[in-house]
Amino acid sequence: AQNITARIGEPLVLKCKGAPKKPPQRLEWKLNTGRTEAWKVLSPQGGGPWDSVARVLPNGSLFLPAVGIQDEGIFRCQAMNRNGKETKSNYRVRVYQIPGKPEIVDSASELTAGVPNKVGTCVSEGSYPAGTLSWHLDGKPLVPNEKGVSVKEQTRRHPETGLFTLQSELMVTPARGGDPRPTFSCSFSPGLPRHRALRTAPIQPRVWEPVPLEEVQLVVEPEGGAVAPGGTVTLTCEVPAQPSPQIHWMKDGVPLPLPPSPVLILPEIGPQDQGTYSCVATHSSHGPQESRAVSISIIEPGEEGPTAGSVGGSGLGTLALA
């Protein structure tokens, strides 16, 4: 059978080979399509409700005024010329519809490096057969399930027209230190060959690089945190991040009721100041970060200062913030 591809809604003419060019003609068309059960016979005399779908023209050709999805199938003509020679024509008709240009909806303007992000949803409406959607990064195809790329697809069929709507949601995990303005696009590839792909307008989200969280350093003077009664201890919270975060202080796991400051001075140390101290840096972009804890202890004259003193009383004594 000869393969014929016809666009939905367009007319189609199928030639009946060997048919006399004008009546009287001995020919018959048989069709087996979505509109028929087994074979439907159409003759040149025809003329009837089937004319809305297919009718035999005076030259013996079969004319379909507006091809529909239900017209996919087999069309056969059997004709006899004036000399009694029989000729058969056999066609396999497939139909197609090109959708409108695909679009990317719900697109992200900003992506975060190192974590999965939804880039957007590509939508194609009105195709037949369904066809496929694919994503591109900087013009190169993106392969799902590779290098942090995942795609969620959905296909719906219109209950009346039978045409397809395709949706494809793209998730990516941009690499740190990669392209700060990647270009994403989506293309629709028709289900029938010989039809070029349709591509969306590109989108260019910014990639935001979160500053790597460097450790919050707590420096204590004197080193080791052991001090004679009445001495002074200085705790300094060092945070490399910019802009400078807010620094709060903790003692024995409880926040100290003090205004934010990167330096905590404990003058005239007494037993009530002994304990475990840490600082907490709060960044606007990624929450609080706590330093290691250090122990502050009192040593009597002549004692060796321990690196980690035991926890003492809970009194605050006198605190000074630089």
């Epitope: 028929t36 059960e37 003329g47 009837g48 409700p49 089937w50 004319d51 809305s52 779908v53």
Partner: antibody
Framework: EVQLVESGGGLVQPGGSLRLSCAAS????????MTWVRQAPGKGLEWVAS????????YYPDSVKDRFTISRDNAKNSLYLQMNSLRAEDTAVYYC????????????WGQGTLVTVSS | DIQMTQSPSSLSASVGDRVTITCRAS??????VNWFQQKPGKAPRRLIY???NLADGVPSRFSGSRSGTDFTLTISSLQPEDFATYYC?????????FGGGTKVEIK
């Protein structure tokens, strides 16, 4: 909402003529075949004529062929039935209906107009 | 021309009854048969299209079936508003042919 409104019926003498009209609204008129169906008093339904959406092809049963002519004006969303050489047996309510083809056969009907052929 | 032989021509039934009306085509008409309901003084209303499909707005107690050239309209539980005349229509070929009608009356 699809609406079909017939007009032009009335009393006519045998051998006379009458022209029925059908005004269509609520759908894209030139996309559809149109049909006239009639019903004699106390009788069943009988197909009278059909026309394709372009108006190029018309179809009739033998009982009215050569006497009745179906036509349409797509610009005016109107369907017509020109009835000549009327006979007593043409007395009926005439309905205009959308469709009559394989794709869409008579889902919508007008309320009908009565044609009486009598001397 | 195709003949559509409809039976019975009339029937009496009660509310709640199951009612079956049949049309037999004189030759193969595929699935191209519709069923209509008509009440006195009103235009016909399409109930079933292409043998088995329920038209929009038609109650689900109506159904259509086909076996070869035999077409059946079934009302599963007759309601008071269903007392009317029912017609089948063949539209596979011209002339379009209606069945003779079945009048459903109250018993």
């Amino acid at each position: 909402e699809v609406q079909l409104v017939e007009s032009g019926g009335g009393l006519v003498q045998p051998g006379g003529s009458l022209r029925l009209s059908c005004a269509a609204s609520g759908f894209t008129f030139n996309n559809y075949w149109m049909t006239w169906v009639r019903q004699a008093p106390g009788k069943g339904l009988e197909w009278v004529a059909s026309i394709d959406n372009s108006g190029d092809n018309t179809y009739y049963p033998d009982s009215v062929k050569d006497r009745f002519t179906i036509s349409r004006d797509n610009a005016k969303n109107s369907l017509y039935l020109q009835m000549n050489s009327l006979r007593a047996e043409d007395t009926a309510v005439y309905y205009c209906a959308r469709g009559g083809d394989i794709l869409d056969s008579l889902p919508y009907w007008g309320q009908g107009t009565l044609v009486t052929v009598s001397s | 021309d195709i003949q559509m032989t409809q039976s019975p021509s009339s029937l009496s039934a009660s509310v709640g009854d199951r009612v079956t009306i049949t049309c037999r085509a004189s030759q193969d008409v595929g699935i191209y048969v519709n069923w209509f309901q008509q009440k006195p003084g009103k235009a016909p209303r399409r109930l079933i299209y292409r043998a088995t499909n329920l038209a929009d707005g038609v109650p689900s107690r109506f159904s259509g079936s086909r076996s070869g050239t035999d077409f059946t309209l079934t009302i599963s539980s007759l309601q008071p508003e269903d007392f009317a005349t029912y017609y089948c229509l063949e539209f596979d070929e011209h002339p379009l042919t209606f069945g003779g009608g079945t009048k459903v009356e109250i018993k």
